[in-house]
């Protein structure tokens, strides 16, 4: 009861002057509030409140539900309280069966007692099941039993308040604990594809998946640098307790070029936020861009192999690819494949494998590719390097010695004279005439060179060498001379190939 200080307002006095009162069920509750400035009585139990403006609170036939805290308040706002237990053997507990707890916080199981003199006031699992080993609780007969630091694992735990009354264990109605999780991490967000490429008029649809411990996670699609609200559709699932998934699908039914940009899926909870982006590129029509992986002018030695390789971007997907040489289409020797297995891949590779090329196989090799919107092509000019071959070596009627050689690159013909029987021909002879015979012919064949010298310049027996050479190799042909009197005769010419 309050102590009175003279001159200061004091709290009211209550009769009976006790902090607690035990009344048997059916008996009278009579409480008197003594205060010159009496205002009201208030009764509270389990979040229920009743008021009475009379200074005497009378309940003629007390029931268990009259158990609770009775507070008298005066005009100064000062109050005094008495707690009344209405002992009812048939109703030991008052219960509010709704039981919710926040993870890591305490929660109150509302089962105040109607009899404070019972023993072993505690919690028990339903159907004799034990409570979780780590569950700690604190009983309070006037309020109920507080579960300390609620765990996620306690979700949907079924329990009773329990007490021993006259040697017998009594259970309350059952409670089902519902645990609200604490957000201990940001939401997990992912997107169906990181980038999209579309033609104007096509539908853009992208799905963001948000995963969290509760459906109380915020998510939205945003366009970067724009405040426009985007239209999205949701699907959601609970894959068990504390395992929530939402799919937020953004759709633009007919995409336009100016819809291109970066779209962000943003999600947040009380812990923090997370986001993921996808890029949309809308083109007015499809395209093909070809990138040669080797120089488009190719030089290759006779008998060697070469691979002609292109990479190309094609959108939409390529429909027809072919390699062509001299108006003929290759049916084999080439392969075409996507650069990656990624669903959004638009880059492809095509390779033509040319093996043991002959001098006659130089020319233009063309790669053609098309899709539903465009065609594109690229040409490779292939030159086959060949060692010179001496086609003719003759003494003409006008006394000229003529040597004709073919090869690629264009051969150079040098002449040498070897006096007597010497095999080494070191004295060079200047040609009278040099002509490239097929310079205006097909561009990729061997080049034919004709060179002539005047044999009248030779006064002694000996050998004349015609040497044709280029970057690949050299070949020689020989003319033997013998003088009979004043007559010069050409003995059979012969060739000597020098690699």
């Amino acid at each position: 009861q309050p102590s009175v200080s003279p001159g200061e307002p004091s709290p009211p006095s209550i009769h009976p002057a006790k902090s607690e009162l035990i009344v048997r069920v059916g008996n009278e509750i009579r409480l008197l509030c003594i205060d010159p400035g009496f205002v009201k009585w208030t009764f509270e139990i389990l979040d229920e409140t009743n008021e009475n403006k009379q200074n005497e609170w009378i309940t003629e036939k007390a029931e268990a539900t009259n158990t609770g805290k009775y507070t008298c308040t005066n005009k100064h706002g000062l109050s005094s309280s008495i707690y009344v237990f209405v002992r009812d053997p048939a109703k030991l507990f008052l219960v509010d069966r709704s039981l919710y707890g926040k993870e890591d916080n305490d929660t109150l199981v509302r089962c105040p007692l109607t009899d404070p003199e019972v023993t072993s006031y505690s919690l028990k699992g339903c159907q004799g099941k034990p409570l979780p080993k780590d569950l700690r609780f604190v009983p309070d007969p006037k309020a109920g039993i507080t579960i300390k630091s609620v765990k996620r694992a306690y979700h949907r735990l079924c329990l009773h308040c329990s007490a021993d009354q006259e040697g017998k264990s009594v259970l309350s109605d059952k409670f089902i604990l519902k645990v609200r999780p604490a957000f201990k991490a940001v939401p997990v967000v992912s997107v169906s594809k990181a980038s999209y490429l579309l033609r104007e008029g096509e539908e853009f649809t992208v799905t963001c998946t948000i995963k969290d411990v509760s459906s109380s996670v915020y998510s939205t699609w945003k366009r970067e640098n724009s405040q426009t609200k985007l239209q999205e559709k949701y699907n959601s699932w609970h894959h068990g307790d504390f395992n929530y998934e939402r799919q937020a699908t953004l759709t633009i039914s007919s995409a336009r070029v100016n819809d291109s940009g970066v779209f962000m899926c943003y999600a947040n909870n009380t812990f923090g936020s997370a986001n993921v982006t996808t890029t949309l590129e809308v083109v007015d029509k499809g395209f093909i861009n070809i990138f040669p992986m080797i120089n488009t002018t190719v030089f290759v030695n006779d008998g060697e192999n070469v691979d002609l390789i292109v990479e190309y971007e094609a959108f939409p997907k390529p429909e027809h690819q072919q390699w062509i040489y001299m108006n003929r289409t290759f049916t084999d020797k080439w392969e075409d494949y996507p650069k990656s297995e990624n669903e959004s891949n638009i880059r492809y590779v095509s390779e033509l494998h040319l093996t043991r090329l002959k001098g006659t196989e130089g020319g233009t090799y063309t790669f053609l590719v098309s899709n539903s919107d465009v065609n594109a092509s690229i040409a490779f000019n292939v030159y086959v390097n060949t060692k010179p071959e001496i086609l003719t070596y003759d003494r003409l009627v006008n006394g000229m010695l003529q040597c004709v050689a073919a090869g690629f690159p264009e051969p150079t013909i040098d002449w040498y004279f070897c006096p007597g029987t010497e095999q080494r021909c070191s004295a060079s002879v200047l040609p009278v005439d040099v002509q490239t015979l097929n310079a205006s012919g097909p561009p990729f064949g061997k080049l034919v060179v004709q060179s002539s010298i005047d044999s009248s310049a030779f006064k002694h027996n000996g050998t004349v060498e015609c040497k044709a050479y280029n970057d690949v190799g050299k070949t020689s042909a020989y003319f033997n001379f013998a003088f009979k009197g004043n007559n010069k005769e050409q003995i059979h010419p012969h060739t000597l190939f020098t690699p």
Epitope: L46, D96, Y100, K102, R180, S215, T270
Partner: antibody, heavy 119, light 106 residues
Framework: QVQLVQSGAEVKKPGSSVKVSCKAS????????ISWVRQAPGQGLEWMGG????????NYAQKFQGRVTITADESTSTAYMELSSLRSEDTAVYYC????????????WGRGTLVTVSS | DIQMTQSPSSLSASVGDRVTITCRAS??????LNWYQQKPGKAPKLLIY???SLQSGVPSRFSGSGSGTDFTLTISSLQPEDFATYYC????????FGGGTKVEIK
Amino acid sequence: QVQLVQSGAEVKKPGSSVKVSCKASGGTFSLYAISWVRQAPGQGLEWMGGIIPHFGLANYAQKFQGRVTITADESTSTAYMELSSLRSEDTAVYYCARGGLDTDEFDLWGRGTLVTVSS
Amino acid sequence: DIQMTQSPSSLSASVGDRVTITCRASQSINSYLNWYQQKPGKAPKLLIYAASSLQSGVPSRFSGSGSGTDFTLTISSLQPEDFATYYCQQGVSDITFGGGTKVEIK
């Protein structure tokens, strides 16, 4: 025991909005899930959306997305449902119920509020 | 959305009869299924939660079973106060209710 007390019946014109309240007496209101479920005359039950006041974020059924707003005031233990762009087919009894989010069952219902949409 | 199909849509029975109502989900909902009873002009009342758990205060003649996609509500011995409409409801995805089963007096 906890009760959910709803606001009174409403008559509205097509195109207008209606806001229905639901006051919880007692309990841990902030941790409840409060949902709104409607029932057109002679029809079945249709979930509109719900909120857990502690988290403050509402979830809506796809059908009502953009047309319904569910809010909660923890200080008064009251939840609200506002439905806009009303049409005649929105005539129904609107119930508030405890549960409906994060797999909670509806274990407590309000008495319902009749909303009539008529020109 | 997950569709909930209840059958039958209505049935006639007598006091004391055993009544069975079935509910089928269009995809698996584990055990996240609840049953409600509604009487004319009243709000629904929870009978069974989590497919088979009896709500406090509900008579033991009501029972529920099933998991995945197929569920059953059984009233072992129909009482006069049980004539009402019964709804199933799933809680895995956006909440959906079955179309209801009206239990009438034969």
